[in-house]
Interface confidence: low
């Protein structure tokens, strides 16, 4: 028996359902009584879901997995993972045994989009050219870690005096805070781009300083 899986990682959004595709080619006359199907975590060998002795043995992994029982006889051994969490990320092995056996691994990459960045300024009044200001760009509840880029009004990257920190909450999602320290010109726009490297999602925030008032 030959097992086939997707070579590309499966990307799943947090709290959605993901399908880890796995298939095999059944011989003529194949019956489910012959099938032993095991899904396990590749690294730790922890059992996730199994089908043995002609029946679905159910989920061994937080009761959030399911097979496609009507499609098994056609060679579809895919696994449905419900309400995906950050901690589900990793490699899963699909192990199929009929008379002989084969296995293959598929990777699950979890992702969550970042919120539109909020911008804060310190100090936020009585600003004059030549003043040093601190601009903070904050974006929330994303995964995985964001990449943060700063640019001025002409699109020129600002790389000096940038400090970025990331904090994971109990669900493993990240809040990102990036701080730019800059000397004010006569006026100017400062933009922050928060990029999710998996989703290729960009979230933009900007602040324009033109004397008073400030524009966010």
């Amino acid at each position: 028996v030959e097992v086939q899986v997707s070579e590309d990682p499966v990307v799943a959004l947090v709290d959605t359902d993901a399908t880890l595709r796995c298939s095999f080619s059944p011989e003529p006359g194949f019956s489910l009584a012959q099938l032993n199907l095991i899904w396990q975590l590749t690294d730790t060998k922890q059992l996730v879901h199994s089908f043995t002795e002609g029946r679905d043995q159910g989920s061994a992994y937080s009761n959030r997995t399911a097979l496609f029982p009507d499609l098994l006889v056609q060679g579809n051994a895919s696994l449905r993972l419900q309400r995906v969490r950050v901690t589900d990320e990793g490699s899963y092995t699909c192990f199929v045994s009929i008379q002989d056996f084969d296995s293959a691994a598929v990777s699950l990459q979890v992702a969550a989009p970042y919120s539109k960045p909020s911008m804060t300024l310190e100090p936020n009044k009585d600003l004059r050219p030549g003043n040093m200001v601190t601009i903070t760009c904050s974006s929330y509840q994303g995964y995985p870690e964001a990449e943060v880029f700063w640019k001025d009004g002409q699109g020129v990257p600002l790389t000096g005096n940038v400090t970025t920190s990331q904090m994971a909450n109990e669900r493993g999602l990240f809040d990102v805070h990036s701080v730019l320290r800059v000397v004010l010109g006569a006026n100017g726009t400062y933009s922050c781009l928060v990029r999710n490297p998996v989703l290729q999602q960009d979230a933009h925030g900007s602040v324009t300083i033109t004397g008073q008032p400030l524009t966010f």
Epitope: Q109, E145, A146, E147, Q166, A168, E170, G172, P197
Partner: antibody
């Protein structure tokens, strides 16, 4: 075989500079976050710096090295670098590079190099 | 920055005995905690991640537990190759990633 190999350590005077390299093999280097961790003689582990996956990605530093050390990577050469300037006696340590166990993320390091020794002394 | 405090500093035990190492975080790190083993002259080796998941190839005698601020690494029956220094590391809030000060497990 997944492997990391550091080089570039040596003896340098206070105020001097050194550039460490970490050559990666056996895995898709560009997919993984990388870190530098050091260990002073007889002391524990101290995270020094880390860099995310893309060329223009985020670099992070411990307060003790911020403004003096610069981490970078060349994905085409499968190599991680640590440029160390304005070195001090307290930077004397074995420097390890480490690969995160999961792409796109700082978590825990499942692959480590053998370390390269940096000695700062006059 | 999150500070990790490991205790005891040194644990003197005989082969076959049970070792219990603790790691306490200055604030909650959820289960974003790893344990490493380091032998003299060698690089650290990842034992446990996610507070309780054994890394690939790590024997079942190593067990991690805990969440929030209090964590334990238990070695159920010490083998000669287990005598080493053990470090915990958090990865909930960074930078910086932080390590505990280490616990040395030595032969009694």
């Amino acid at each position: 075989e997944v492997q990391l190999l550091e080089s570039g350590g040596g003896l340098v005077q206070p105020g001097g500079s050194l550039r460490l390299s970490c050559a990666a093999s056996g895995f898709t280097f560009s997919d993984y976050y990388m870190s530098w961790v050091r260990q002073a003689p007889g002391k524990g582990l101290e995270w020094v710096s880390g860099i995310s996956i893309s060329y223009g990605g985020n670099a992070y530093y411990a307060d003790s090295v911020k403004g003096r050390f610069t981490v970078s990577r060349d994905n085409s050469k499968n190599t991680l670098y640590l440029q160390m300037n304005s070195l001090r006696a307290e930077d004397t340590a074995v420097y390890y590079c480490g690969r995160d166990r999961s792409p796109y993320q700082y978590r825990s390091m499942d692959v480590w190099g053998q370390g390269t020794t940096v000695t700062v002394s006059s | 920055e999150i500070v990790l405090t490991q205790s005891p500093g040194t644990l003197s035990l005989s082969p076959g005995e049970r070792a219990t190492l603790t790691c306490r975080a200055s604030q909650s790190v959820g289960d974003f905690l790893a344990w490493y083993q380091q032998k003299p002259g060698q690089a650290p080796r990842l034992l446990i991640y996610g507070a309780s998941t054994r890394a690939a190839g790590i024997p079942a005698r190593f067990r991690g537990s805990g969440s929030g601020t209090d964590f334990t690494l238990t070695i159920s029956s010490l083998q000669s190759e287990d005598f080493a220094v053990y470090y915990c590391q958090q990865y909930k809030n960074w930078p910086p990633l932080t390590f505990g000060g280490g616990t040395k497990v030595e032969i009694k």
